[in-house]
């Protein structure tokens, strides 16, 4: 269980405005059981990106297919950019917990930067 | 075993309220979405509201929207679903039913239903 | 809404013949759709997840393809048990819509 990483393999991503960012995030193992989560930034500020746990984010998307078993690809796709989105963004392991699931591992984090719109 | 035991359903008047209940059993309730899903005799399925693991996310069908609320007692492994201002369209079998994780997941054990029947 | 297309709505075939039900979305739901078997008087029963993952305990006769707009459930060999409603829905965005289903009787 302690083996498990979580693997952000791009340092840093730049993306013009106005197109998708795509952040990629991989686990080495599908233990312990428990969802991802992507956050924009570090500590408590921190901003919820997605979860795979809850909710619909309409500007996110993942890259793979989450609901299918043995998945360890947990890269997302985010519409539309604007300069706003730019910062560091982490993917997060959290384990299944009672009664808060409890954060396990963090990616290294990516930073995201915008690049003006081309005219 | 998983079991979804709906009760609450009815015959209720125009106007009037009502509150059906669902009592998961058999897994972890507080790890999964729970939704509600009605059939009106005859008719198709119709998604009527969902409800995240933690009560974070909640979305209502148009249809409902303003009448209905949905919510959880995680405590208690319990679903509900409050409606309000009934109208005759809204006679239908109610299941609710469980989601794994996040919005994208397919609705994998329902409970068998329970009959709301509006009319004066 | 994403508008659910079933086709045919209903359906005469005979055990042992392959049925195809096909379901068409109104937009791009990625592989975000999901087939329901529903008995009279029953609630439905989750047979396809995600276009092609065939859910624990269902027979292997039932599978799925797509992806996209354009859906497919396929029977490959009839059995008297099989004779219901099936429908497609999609979990790719709010709200969740439903096929209007399609009935499948006996010949």
């Known amino acids: 269980e302690e083996g498990l990483q979580v693997i952000q393999p791009d340092k840093s991503v730049s993306v013009a405005a106005g197109e998708s960012a795509i952040l990629h995030c991989t686990a080495t193992s599908l233990i312990p059981v428990g969802p991802i989560q992507w956050f924009r930034g570090a500590g408590p500020g921190r901003e919820l990106i997605y979860n795979q746990k809850e909710g619909h984010f309409p500007r996110v998307t993942t890259v793979s297919d989450l609901t299918k078993r043995n998945n360890m690809d947990f890269s997302i796709r985010i519409g539309n950019i604007t300069p706003a989105d730019a910062g560091t963004y982490y993917c997060v392991k959290f384990r299944k917990g009672s009664p808060d699931d409890v954060e396990f591992k963090s990616g290294a984090g990516t930073e995201l930067s915008v690049r003006a719109k081309p005219s | 075993e998983v079991q979804l035991v709906e009760s609450g359903g009815g015959v209720v008047q125009p106007g009037r309220s009502l509150r059906l209940s669902c009592a998961a059993s058999?897994?972890?309730?507080?790890?999964?979405?729970m939704i509600w899903v009605r059939q009106a005799p005859g008719k198709g399925l119709e998604w009527v509201a969902s409800i995240s693991s933690s009560s974070s996310y909640i979305y209502y069908a148009d249809s409902v929207k303003g009448r209905f609320t949905i919510s959880r007692d995680n405590s208690k492994n319990t679903l509900y679903l409050q409606m309000n201002s009934l109208r005759a369209e809204d006679t239908a079998v109610y299941y609710c039913a469980r989601r794994y994780y996040g919005f994208n997941y397919p609705f994998d054990y329902w409970g068998q239903g329970t009959m709301v029947t509006v009319s004066s | 809404a994403i508008q659910l297309t079933q086709s045919p709505s209903s359906l005469s075939a005979s055990v042992g013949q392959r049925v195809t039900i096909t379901c068409g979305a109104s937009?791009?739901?990625?592989?975000?759709m999901h087939w329901y078997q529903q008995k009279p008087g029953k609630a439905p029963k989750l047979l396809i997840y995600s276009a092609s993952n065939l859910e624990a305990g269902v027979p292997s006769r039932f599978s799925g393809s797509g992806s996209g707009t354009d859906f497919t459930l396929t029977i490959s060999s009839l059995q008297p048990e099989d004779f219901a409603t099936y429908y497609c829905q999609q979990s790719n965005e709010p709200p969740y819509t439903f096929g209007q289903g399609t009935k499948l009787e006996i010949k």
């Open positions: 058999g897994f972890t309730f507080s790890d999964y979405g």
């Open positions: 937009k791009s739901v990625r592989t975000y």
